[in-house]
Amino acid sequence: FKVATPYSLYVCPEGQNVTLTCRLLGPVDKGHDVTFYKTWYRSSRGEVQTCSERRPIRNLTFQDLHLHHGGHQAANTSHDLAQRHGLESASDHHGNFSITMRNLTLLDSGLYCCLVVEIRHHHSEHRVHGAMELQVQTGKDAPSNCVVYPSSSQDSENITAA
């Protein structure tokens, strides 16, 4: 499978809510011996590989925000911890995987990464990730609502798979 990022850039006004989205593409094994681990984190655009570094989102680590389930099951973070920080990650039956951030501030601007790992009994992990930029703006130049910019078809297909 691969991960696609439908949008590569989100431009939002301060105070708004935003939902960043990744999508699993391709066949997803739903067997009893496979588990999917999905999470979000902030990162930096590395010279060699984007999304290598795992920084917290609003002080929550990638482990605080992770989802853990089989196949295309739906899941979401029930952590009070995440919700207290205005965050919720969720996954639906169709391969969509998102994080919602409430009441954005300028400090939320940056690069965000989704990570999906297929974990199988006796097999090495299959790891894929996607990246997107969030720009939070204030003042008269800020949009009234979030504006999203689609990834180019090349970007959404050329996702790192390790």
Epitope: D33, T35, Y37, T39, G46, V48, Q49, S52, E53, R54, F62, Q63, H66, H68, L115, V117, I119, R120, H121, H122, H123, S124, E125, R127, A162
Partner: antibody, heavy 119, light 107 residues
């Protein structure tokens, strides 16, 4: 703060089974998204990964040891265990338990315990 | 199995020196490489993950670089507490493997 503590016999006879326990404090061994692994280091030598167990129960072993090794967890005791059977003197080493998150390296280690195989 | 080869196997340096240790993988491992520091009678301590990302709490004089098969660990200005043995480890695929170690000694 997470702490890992290995325990078990310091001396095992050749052909017998080496059994070690890793007791986890400051966190739950059943937390999803983590592996519990064992690494060993013969005296004066380098590190060798023995195997890991994922929170959902999946196991991963080094092929060089696979026929002799079993890693398991006891969630009620918050412990991981290592069993290595048919030991020889080549299995003399410091044995470490360690934790690693999904798609990450070993970020928390126990202090290690020396196991000597000798008659 | 992926073989990890470190060089040099030992190194003598002085406080304040800049030191570089290299690690080569027998096949490509993307950026799935970690560096550890180990002092005598102690467990290894993670310094770098994902080839170049500093583990929380590790001094910024440590840095890592590389991707694919060739990687380096650099200590920009050696401190007395940095004299130890350093190991690289690939976590691209099982079985996870370590380099043979580089012992950093005081000149």
């Amino acid at each position: 703060q997470l702490q890992l503590q290995e325990s078990g016999p310091g001396l095992v006879k050749p052909s017998e089974t080496l059994s070690l326990t890793c007791t986890v404090s400051g966190g739950s061994i059943s937390s999803s998204g983590y592996y519990w692994g064992w690494i060993r280091q013969p005296p004066g030598k380098g590190l060798e990964w023995i195997g890991s167990l994922y929170s959902s129960g999946y196991t991963y072993y080094n092929p060089s040891l696979k026929s002799r090794v079993t890693i398991s967890v006891d969630t009620s005791k918050n412990q991981a265990s290592l069993k290595l059977n048919s030991v020889t003197t080549a299995d003399t080493a410091v044995y470490y338990c360690a934790r690693h998150p999904v798609a990450m390296n070993f970020d928390d280690w126990g202090q290690g315990t020396l196991v000597t195989v000798s008659s | 199995d992926i073989q990890m080869t470190q060089s040099p196997s030992s190194l003598s340096a002085s406080v304040g020196d800049r030191v570089t240790i290299t690690c080569r993988a027998s096949q490509g491992i993307s950026s799935w490489l970690a560096w550890y520091q180990q002092k005598p009678e102690k467990a290894p301590k993670s310094l770098i993950y994902a080839a170049s990302s500093l583990q929380s709490g590790v001094p910024s004089r440590f840095s890592g670089s590389g991707s694919g098969t060739d990687f380096t660990l650099t200590i920009s200005s050696l401190q007395p507490e940095d004299f130890a043995t350093y190991y690289c480890q690939q976590y691209n695929s099982y079985p996870y493997t370590f380099g043979q170690g580089t012992k950093l000694e005081i000149k």
